[in-house]
Amino acid sequence: MKVLQEPTCVSDYMSISTCEWKMNGPTNCSTELRLLYQLVFLLSEAHTCIPENNGGAGCVCHLLMDDVVSADNYTLDLWAGQQLLWKGSFKPSEHVKPRAPGNLTVHTNVSDTLLLTWSNPYPPDNYLYNHLTYAVNIWSENDPADFRIYNVTYLEPSLRIAASTLKSGISYRARVRAWAQCYNTTWSEWSPSTKWHNSYREPFEQH
């Protein structure tokens, strides 16, 4: 049994780091493998993650962490029984993938303005809470070419757009994702999308 693709890990900078790797053949990850992780710090103990299958030869492990600070560094040991298959390390602050925003809502009752709001996925005491910026993706269900991205570079988890920038009388979907420049993170996954019917009063044409 050998590791074909070494574990790579990302942290949500809150409570979970996710490591993925591939074995050289079909593997029952949860019965054959264990990923041990230990904070490199005084009096810390090793903790065990039981991996799950992620495709035939792929494994994924969700490492539970109490919290994360920038200095944290973990040793990782991948075991198959008594055999050490791989040894490495992981610094969560250097591999951050934020949590996806939630509760995306489209408010259509504000005159001819669309107000999109969502929730910051972090609690106020988490460092990322005040450092997230967002990208909002809006697209038409009827017209694949009608696809747009709005970058929200302020901290407020909301976006206002004129309803008239979208076509009237058709359905649109929106989703939002987050990233944090401070830790040069990757983008989060997209939030679940939300759907609404776009309709607004066309202004009277004056001749």
């Epitope: 992780y37 904070l39 710090f41 005084l42 009096l43 810390s44 103990e45 090793a46 903790h47 539970l64 962490m65 109490d66 919290d67 600070v69 920038s70 200095a71 944290d72 460092y127």
Partner: antibody
């Protein structure tokens, strides 16, 4: 009530051995690291040794390394300090103290928040 | 090893007056944001040490609010806003960032 009670101190000749014990109660003993600190007569406090909750990790002061062994029996909620090759400079009151919570991924530290009453070790011929 | 230096070593105080003890470390005790591994302990005559402050500024359970800790990195301070007779004893700072854990020499607080 969270409590630590030391025992095992006494008078011993140079080169001799003693085993100190520290019985914990009122907290989940196995979840916490434990530490020994000593105080020579009329002197300040000196750290001696520490051990993680499972006993897998131990640390020693240079002055006792190779002579003292820290261990624990979590089934008995007891911490030990085996002291061999005793020297006159080991004469002190020995305290055990409850250290950080090591059952968590990040050891949670709230100081050495509980101390035993101390046990006196005298090394003299 | 990290060397801890306390000052003053002797501190005569009038009851009701404030008192301040300084502690300096030879290396930074800041592990990461919000984690300075510096404690303060009080040892009264004939007793075991008791924890006053942990992680530089957190008051231990049951410690009166006249005791406060501050500082970060290498410079730390213990303040007593109004000294009471029961506060006499030796005050020690201690670092637990790295082994060996090291203590300051101790400050003897006495009532004038």
């Amino acid at each position: 009530e969270v409590q630590l009670v030391e025992s095992g101190g006494g008078l011993e000749q140079p080169g001799g051995s003693l085993r100190l014990s520290c019985a914990g109660s009122g907290f989940t003993f196995r979840d916490y690291a434990m530490t020994w600190v000593r105080q020579a007569p009329g002197k300040g406090l000196e750290w001696v040794s520490s051990i993680s909750g499972s006993g897998s990790t131990t640390y020693y002061a240079d002055s006792v390394k190779g002579r003292f062994t820290i261990s624990r029996d979590n089934s008995k909620n007891t911490l030990y300090l085996q002291m061999n090759s005793l020297r006159a400079e080991d004469t002190a009151v020995y305290y055990c103290a409850k250290d950080r919570l090591t059952a968590s991924v990040r050891p949670i530290y709230v100081g050495l928040d509980v101390w035993g009453q101390g046990t006196t070790v005298t090394v003299s011929s | 090893d990290i060397v801890m230096t306390q000052s003053p070593l002797s501190l005569p105080v009038t009851p009701g007056e404030p008192a301040s003890i300084s502690c300096r470390s030879s290396q930074s005790l800041l592990y990461s944001e919000g984690y300075n591994y510096l404690d303060w302990y009080l040892q009264k005559s004939g007793q075991s040490p008791q924890l006053l402050i942990y992680l530089a500024s957190n008051r231990a359970s049951g410690v009166p609010d006249r005791f406060s800790g501050s500082g970060s990195g290498t410079d730390f301070t213990l303040k007593i806003s109004r000294v009471e007779a029961e506060d006499v004893g030796f005050y020690y700072c201690m670092q637990t960032l790295k082994t060996p854990y090291t203590f300051g020499q101790g400050t003897k607080l006495e009532i004038k």
